[in-house]
């Protein structure tokens, strides 16, 4: 069969080889397409409801006034010339539609190095067959699932036209110390060959390099966290980062209902104050960072060091 590629909505003429150029003609077209369940026969004398889709012209050719998705399939003509010689023509018709130029929507203006970022979503509307979307960084193809690159794809089909809408969401983790203004673009490659790719306008987000956070230090006074009943313990959370982050306090893994402060004072220690304390620093551009945990315990008179102690109620400390 001869392969024919036709654009959706355009007319198509299929020649019936060996057919006399003018009536009377002995010929028959047979179609097996999305509009038929088996073979549909069309003859020159035809003329009827199928004319809107396909009709035999006076010269024996089959005319499709506006090719649609349902017209994909096999078209055969059997013709007999004046001398009784039979000729067969066989066509395999495939249809296509080029979408509009793809676009990048919801694009990020800034990316953060070292963490996953959504770059944007590439959208292509009105293709057939579906085709594919691919991303490029500085003109080179980006390979999903490699070097911090991930792509989420979605394909939808219009219920009436049958045309496809493709969406591709790009996530990247920019390397620290890399290009501060990378260029991303997206391209649509048609499902049928011999058609060039369509590329979006590029986007150039800035890459922000976060200053690495030094460890959050928790200093305990008295050292070791062991104190006699009625004594005072001072916990200080030290974070070198600028601007100063918010500091919250945890006891036994549970946040203490206190306003943010870098210093926690536990005056007149009682059994209810025993437990494990830590501080959490929250910076606007980072996730929360927790310090090491320290254990606060009560030394009964005559003992040499921290005891297990019993954990009492939730006595709250005061903040400096």
């Amino acid at each position: 069969a001869q392969n024919i590629t036709a654009r959706i909505g355009e007319p198509l003429v299929l020649k019936c080889k060996g057919a006399p150029k003018k009536p009377p003609q002995r010929l028959e077209w047979k179609l097996n397409t999305g509009r038929t369940e088996a073979w549909k026969v069309l003859s020159p004398q035809g003329g009827g409801p199928w004319d809107s889709v396909a009709r035999v012209l006076p010269n024996g050719s089959l005319f499709l006034p506006a090719v649609g998705i349902q017209d994909e399939g096999i078209f055969r003509c059997q013709a007999m010339n004046r001398n009784g010689k039979e000729t067969k023509s066989n066509y395999r018709v495939r249809v296509y539609q080029i979408p509009g130029k793809p676009e990048i929507v919801d694009s990020a203006s800034e990316l953060t190095a070292g963490v996953p970022n959504k770059v944007g979503t590439c959208v292509s509307e009105g293709s057939y067959p579906a085709g594919t979307l691919s991303w490029h960084l500085d003109g080179k193809p980006l390979v999903p699932n490699e070097k911090g690159v991930s792509v989420k794809e979605q394909t939808r089909r219009h219920p009436e036209t049958g045309l496809f809408t493709l969406q591709s969401e790009l996530m990247v983790t920019p390397a620290r110390g890399g290009d501060p203004r990378p260029t991303f673009s997206c391209s649509f490659s048609p499902g049928l060959p011999r058609h060039r790719a369509l590329r979006t306008a590029p986007i150039q987000p800035r890459v922000w390099e976060p200053v690495p956070l030094e460890e959050v230090q928790l200093v305990v006074e008295p050292e070791g966290g062991a104190v006699a009943p009625g004594g005072t313990v001072t916990l200080t959370c030290e974070v070198p980062a600028q601007p100063s982050p918010q500091i919250h306090w945890m006891k036994d893994g549970v946040p203490l209902p206190l306003p943010p402060s870098p210093v926690l004072i536990l005056p007149e220690i009682g059994p209810q104050d025993q437990g494990t304390y830590s501080c959490v620093a929250t910076h606007s551009s980072h996730g929360p960072q927790e310090s090491r945990a320290v254990s606060i315990s009560i030394i009964e008179p005559g003992e040499e060091g921290p005891t297990a102690g019993s954990v009492g109620g939730s006595g709250l400390g005061t903040l400096a």
């Epitope: 509009r35 038929t36 369940e37 088996a38 549909k40 003329g47 009827g48 409801p49 199928w50 004319d51 809107s52 889709v53």
Partner: antibody
């Protein structure tokens, strides 16, 4: 909303002529074939004529061929049926309907107009 | 010309009944059969298109099926508003041919 409104029916003598009109709205008229269907009193439905979207091709059953002519004016969103040499058996309610080809077949109908052929 | 033989020509049924109407085409018409409902003094309304597809706004108790050249309209549970006359139509070839109609009456 798709609307089809027929007009032009009435009483006519055998051998006489009548022109029916159908005003279409609510859709892109020139994208669709159009069809006339009739129904004699107490009887079933009978196809009368179809026309393609451009108006270049028309189709009729033998019962009305050479007597009836279907036409359209896409600029006016209007469909017509010119009926000549009318006979008593042409007495019916005439409906205009959208479609008539294999893509869309008679999905919307007008309310009908009555044609009575009698002396 | 294609003949569409519709049966029965009339039937009596009660609300809630399952009703089946058949049209047989005299030759292959593919999937190109519609079903219509008509009430007295009103225009026909398309129920099913291309043999099996439910038209917009038509209740799901109506369904269409095809086996070769036999086409069936089924009303799964007859409602009071379903008492009407039903027609099939082949539109694969000219002349377009309607079935003779089936009048569904209250038992």
């Amino acid at each position: 909303e798709v609307q089809l409104v027929e007009s032009g029916g009435g009483l006519v003598q055998p051998g006489g002529s009548l022109r029916l009109s159908c005003a279409a709205s609510g859709f892109t008229f020139n994208n669709y074939w159009m069809t006339w269907v009739r129904q004699a009193p107490g009887k079933g439905l009978e196809w009368v004529a179809s026309i393609d979207n451009s108006g270049d091709n028309t189709y009729y059953p033998d019962s009305v061929k050479d007597r009836f002519t279907i036409s359209r004016d896409n600029a006016k969103n209007s469909l017509y049926l010119q009926m000549n040499s009318l006979r008593a058996e042409d007495t019916a309610v005439y409906y205009c309907a959208r479609g008539g080809d294999i893509r869309v077949s008679l999905d919307f109908w007008g309310q009908g107009t009555l044609v009575t052929v009698s002396s | 010309d294609i003949q569409m033989t519709q049966s029965p020509s009339s039937l009596s049924a009660s609300v809630g009944d399952r009703v089946t109407i058949t049209c047989r085409a005299s030759q292959d018409v593919g999937i190109y059969v519609n079903w219509f409902q008509q009430k007295p003094g009103k225009a026909p309304r398309r129920l099913i298109y291309r043999a099996t597809n439910l038209a917009d706004g038509v209740p799901s108790r109506f369904s269409g099926s095809r086996s070769g050249t036999d086409f069936t309209l089924t009303i799964s549970s007859l409602q009071p508003e379903d008492f009407a006359t039903y027609y099939c139509l082949e539109f694969d070839e000219h002349p377009l041919t309607f079935g003779g109609g089936t009048k569904v009456e209250i038992k």
